[in-house]
Interface confidence: low
């Protein structure tokens, strides 16, 4: 539909509250360093302008595109050049180049202070004093730290954040009520951000076709009773929603996501039997619920795939006539039969099938050539199955912390050039796959584990892209989206790496480590472990374990000492000397 005023159209569709929240998210995701007050001012100006357009769609500038309106507003920020450097050059460009320029300057790892949680009473006072500002600040802080966070989903998080404070600030024990809820929101928020980052990377780095293939596979697993045409319609609409959000078109994205949820709920009967509860919820909860809904039961009478995709004499004719539709059908049919496979595995199988048809349909006897194509799938299926089995056994043997340490060592040896904070963050997240997925029965392990690993390895890829230091990482990240995990798994110790010079300062610790939370203390120890491996990449597991055990004992001893700082200074020197000797540094 063509609207005289796009800004009026979106304001009316979304309502003032959601409009303002989404504009704030959009601005904070673009200008990540701007103070909160500056963003609120810009949002209020845009909102007032939108209201004039609602009153009269023919008013001056109301016919301008949202990118033009928002870009013009962002470019009024006085300190743009001082704060953002070359991003200010975006403002010299015209749309659509200006928006593309802003998108390219989004920073996945902005130099912002860690969010420190104030005391519960302080938070409750701030919440009661000015609820609106308190919630806006939440949106602003999350959006600027996560510039690709899925905006309509962030509205859902904000709604839960508000509900937590509304309930808990009246409770007898405010902290006991509030803190677990905030921890849950924080952890879910990080996971949600990382999942969306993969969707945006998929669209931006590998194109719409790659995203659509992912969506066909995932939706076919989730809605195995839906017809192919129905799944294809959902994929087309979902692709539009995510393309918009990843492109900074947050108002359109939120509006289209609401339309998609409405369509799904109106057509439940031809999509899935699992949607009933979701569809009874209010809009934000409904959309979230649909996105997380469990897989429907597979139809009982599905025929063998071989008939249509191997045995039929028309395979090449069908393939040649409409390649992507035929491959889409293959992926749909395979995925709906295999909720036990990861999406990336299904995409590897589809790619193998496509490659086989490309080769065989040009051969003298195509049918003879592709007759055994399903046999080629066996090793592709077994590889992740075996890897997950081995790693779940290791996880069950070691527990999460030591399993993370094993992965830290493994990945530091593979790509030692990567920065230590990135290696720690990524390896810790890789290690969480154990507690997240190994508890599941076999039929659910692979989709849980391998699709989660895809999300985590994408974090490595986007962080590495900002400051590329390793050709091996670049290669695994850019060659094939679906083969990233096998590519990293296949990396051996980097024999070309020149060990880091030993620096005693890296291994100097102070009494402040004693007041850290258990998680922060683990991160300190894991940082030291990465540095150790960078100094001595050929160190054995046993050597590293011995040094880490000594280190843990040293921290425990000094944290119990009366004069902690002296203990850390004196015992620390001894520990460094002993570690150097043990590792032959």
């Amino acid at each position: 539909d063509a609207h005289k005023s796009e800004v009026a159209h979106r304001f009316k569709d979304l309502g003032e509250e959601n409009f303002k929240a989404l504009v704030l998210i959009a601005f904070a995701q673009y200008l990540q360093q701007c103070p909160f007050e500056d963003h609120v001012k810009l949002v209020n100006e845009v909102t007032e302008f939108a209201k004039t357009c609602v009153a009269d769609e023919s008013a001056e500038n109301c016919d301008k595109s949202l990118h033009t309106l928002f870009g013009d507003k962002l470019c009024t920020v006085a300190t743009l050049r001082e704060t953002y450097g070359e991003m200010a050059d975006c403002c010299a460009k015209q749309e659509p180049e200006r928006n593309e320029c802003f998108l390219q300057h989004k920073d996945d790892n902005p130099n912002l202070p860690r969010l420190v949680r104030p005391e519960v009473d302080v938070m409750c006072t701030a919440f009661h004093d000015n609820e609106e500002t308190f919630l806006k600040k939440y949106l602003y802080e999350i959006a600027r730290r996560h510039p690709y966070f899925y905006a309509p989903e962030l509205l859902f998080f904000a709604k839960r954040y508000k509900a937590a404070f509304t309930e808990c600030c009246q409770a007898a024990d405010k902290a006991a009520c509030l803190l677990p809820k905030l921890d849950e929101l924080r952890d879910e928020g990080k996971a949600s951000s990382a999942k969306q980052r993969l969707k945006c990377a998929s669209l931006q780095k590998f194109g719409e076709r790659a995203f659509k293939a992912w969506a066909v596979a995932r939706l076919s697993q989730r809605f195995p009773k839906a017809e192919f045409a129905e799944v294809s319609k959902l994929v087309t609409d979902l692709t539009k929603v995510h393309t918009e959000c990843c492109h900074g078109d947050l108002l359109e994205c939120a509006d289209d996501r609401a339309d998609l949820a409405k369509y799904i709920c109106e057509n439940q009967d031809s999509i899935s039997s699992k949607l009933k509860e979701c569809c009874e919820k209010p809009l934000l909860e409904k959309s979230h619920c649909i996105a997380e809904v469990e897989n429907d039961e597979m139809p009982a009478d599905l025929p063998s795939l071989a008939a249509d995709f191997v045995e039929s004499k028309d395979v090449c004719k069908n393939y040649a006539e409409a390649k992507d539709v035929f491959l889409g059908m293959f992926l749909y049919e395979y995925a709906r039969r295999h909720p036990d496979y990861s999406v990336v595995l299904l995409l590897r199988l589809a790619k193998t099938y496509e490659t086989t048809l490309e080769k065989c349909c040009a051969a003298a006897d195509p049918h003879e050539c592709y007759a055994k194509v399903f046999d080629e799938f066996k090793p592709l299926v077994e590889e992740p199955q075996n890897l997950i089995k081995q790693n779940c056994e290791l996880f069950e043997q070691l527990g999460e912390y030591k399993f993370q340490n094993a992965l830290l060592v493994r990945y530091t040896k593979k790509v030692p050039q990567v920065s230590t904070p990135t290696l720690v963050e990524v390896s810790r997240n890789l290690g969480k796959v154990g507690s997240k997925c190994c508890k599941h029965p076999e039929a659910k392990r692979m989709p849980c584990a391998e699709d989660y690993l895809s999300v985590v390895l994408n974090q490595l890829c986007v962080l590495h892209e900002k400051t590329p230091v390793s050709d091996r990482v670049t290669k695994c990240c850019t060659e094939s989206l679906v083969n990233r995990r096998p590519c990293f798994s296949a990396l051996e110790v980097d024999e070309t790496y020149v060990p880091k010079e030993f620096n005693a300062e890296t291994f100097t610790f102070h009494a402040d480590i004693c007041t850290l939370s258990e998680k922060e203390r683990q991160i300190k120890k894991q940082t030291a472990l990465v540095e150790l491996v960078k100094h001595k990449p050929k160190a054995t597991k046993e050597q590293l374990k011995a040094v880490m055990d000594d280190f843990a004992a040293f921290v425990e001893k000094c944290c119990k000492a009366d004069d902690k700082e002296t203990c850390f200074a004196e015992e620390g020197k001894k520990l460094v000397a002993a570690s150097q000797a043990a590792l032959g540094l």
């Epitope: 192919f228 319609k233 028309d314 004719k317 069908n318 006539e321 409409a322 539709v325 035929f326």
Partner: nanobody, 115 residues
């Protein structure tokens, strides 16, 4: 709700013409290749003709080449099959499908060629 509704069938004498239409709804018609398939009494489905999503690439079964023409109007979300020089062996139920699938169960339209 995804729907494909065929129309335009009927009784025609050998050598005569018919134009079949297939109105699509509930999915992004312009994104998909489409086909016409027919099923004669007591026989399995037989692929007749296909057209790509943009309408540029068309394909025909040997049995209808030179007599049938497939076309589409993406704005109207409609697929067509112009059938000329009809023969008694063209008698069948004709139905349209997405891509080259014969799995989607639409009602079809009956074409009978008889003197």
């Amino acid at each position: 709700q995804v729907q494909l509704v065929e129309s335009g069938g009927g009784l025609v004498q050998p050598g005569g013409s018919l134009r079949l239409s297939c109105a699509a709804s509930g999915f992004t018609f312009g994104s998909f290749g489409m086909s016409w398939v027919r099923q004669a009494p007591g026989k399995g489905p037989e692929w007749v003709s296909a057209i790509d999503s943009g309408g540029a690439d068309t394909r025909y079964a040997e049995t209808v080449k030179g007599r049938f023409t497939i076309s589409r109007d993406n704005l109207k979300k409609t697929l067509y099959l112009q059938m000329n020089s009809l023969k008694p062996e063209d008698t069948a139920v004709y139905y349209c499908t997405i891509g080259r699938s014969t799995s989607r169960g639409s009602q079809g339209t009956q074409v009978t060629v008889s003197s």
